[in-house]
């Protein structure tokens, strides 16, 4: 088992909004849960966009999940990752 490296980034979207993207890379096996939580609960699926789980050329895999949020409310959002029985949560950078 190779645990993922998880990285959260932000980019400006429309005025007053930002897109936050959570990327997991270099993990094996390919089964992974990657999702955004808002206020500690699941963010609905229709407000998230997922990338495919793709091989990254090193025998491991990569994927991403993104959502659009209001600027100034970053603290309310965390990226949740689960892989091979391990869990971690990742905040949006300031």
């Amino acid at each position: 088992t190779v645990p993922p490296m998880v990285n959260v980034t932000r980019s400006e979207a429309s005025e007053g909004n930002i897109t936050v993207t959570c990327r997991a890379s270099s993990f094996y096996p390919r089964n992974i849960i990657l999702t955004w939580r808002q206020d500690g609960v699941s963010l609905s699926h229709d407000t998230q966009q997922w990338g495919d789980v793709l091989p990254d050329g090193n025998g491991t895999y990569q994927t991403w999940v993104a959502t659009r949020i209001c600027a100034g409310e970053e603290q309310r959002f965390t990226c949740y990752m689960e892989h091979s029985g391990n869990h971690s949560t990742h905040p949006v950078p300031s």
Partner: antibody, heavy 119, light 107 residues
Framework: DVQLQESGPGLVKPSQSLSLTCTVT?????????WNWIRQFPRNKLEWMGY???????NYNPSLKSRISITRDTSKNQFFLQLISVTTEDTATYYC????????????WGQGTLVTVSA | DIQMTQSPASLSASVGETVTITCRAS??????LAWYQQKQGKSPQLLVY???MLADGVPSRFSASGSGTQYSLKINSLQPEDFGSYYC?????????FGAGTKVEIK
């Protein structure tokens, strides 16, 4: 460590309002987290009532939405529960707690305060 | 709302025994589950979060498992301090709801 302490009257008359205070020490309620009220009925059933978060946003249990209000006093690092038009069914031990945004579980609770609704 | 059904409602066990408590959700909660222990006259204390993760300071005789709608809490070699009530709580969506509890008593 975050510490929470509930206070308020132990006896409220039916149709009146129940008002409780949670005093938080060891952490600023404006820094982060969701600050919650949870109650436990005499037969031990637990009910999440709602929260006010670090920015003042509230979220209530729909079963209580028409009767509940959670507010705060940031200068005193306190948050408050008001429940209007109480009945004997609101007799319970009321707890304040908080959760972090990595997941809505409750790592620490206040000691609880028993509120009896009776004429 | 997601309803949480716990079983059994109560059980009697001896020190040293292994006990298992189960919690069933009315919908898939995707491991968004916590377990609490409550002793008489005290506040609930967090035992488990994210379905399987032991909270800080929780002894390793406690373990938790499950997925989808079915979850369980297992206590190996029950100790005197383990007697009390246990509650599950989901945090998949609002409103957050709790199970009705399981009371673990001394046989």
């Amino acid at each position: 460590d975050v510490q929470l302490q509930e206070s308020g009257p132990g006896l409220v008359k039916p149709s009146q309002s129940l008002s409780l205070t949670c005093t938080v020490t060891g952490y600023s309620i404006t820094s982060d987290y969701a600050w919650n009220w949870i109650r436990q009925f005499p037969r031990n059933k637990l009910e999440w009532m709602g929260y006010i978060n670090y920015s003042g946003t509230t979220n209530y249990n729909p079963s209580l939405k028409s009767r509940i209000s959670i507010t705060r006093d940031t200068s005193k690092n306190q948050f408050f529960l008001q429940l209007i038009s109480v009945t004997t069914e609101d007799t319970a031990t009321y707890y304040c707690s908080y959760y972090r945004y990595d997941g809505a579980w409750f790592p620490y609770w206040g000691q609880g305060t028993l509120v009896t609704v009776s004429a | 709302d997601i309803q949480m059904t716990q079983s059994p409602a109560s059980l009697s066990a001896s020190v040293g025994e292994t006990v298992t408590i189960t919690c069933r959700a009315s919908g898939n909660i995707h491991n968004y589950l916590a377990w609490y222990q409550q002793k008489q006259g005290k506040s609930p204390q967090l035992l488990v979060y994210n379905a399987i993760m032991l909270a800080d300071g929780v002894p390793s005789r406690f373990s938790a498992s499950g997925s989808g709608t079915q979850y369980s809490l297992k206590i190996n070699s029950l100790q005197p301090e383990d007697f009390g009530s246990y509650y599950c709580q989901h945090f998949w969506s609002f409103p957050l709801t709790f199970g009705a509890g399981t009371k673990v008593e001394i046989k």
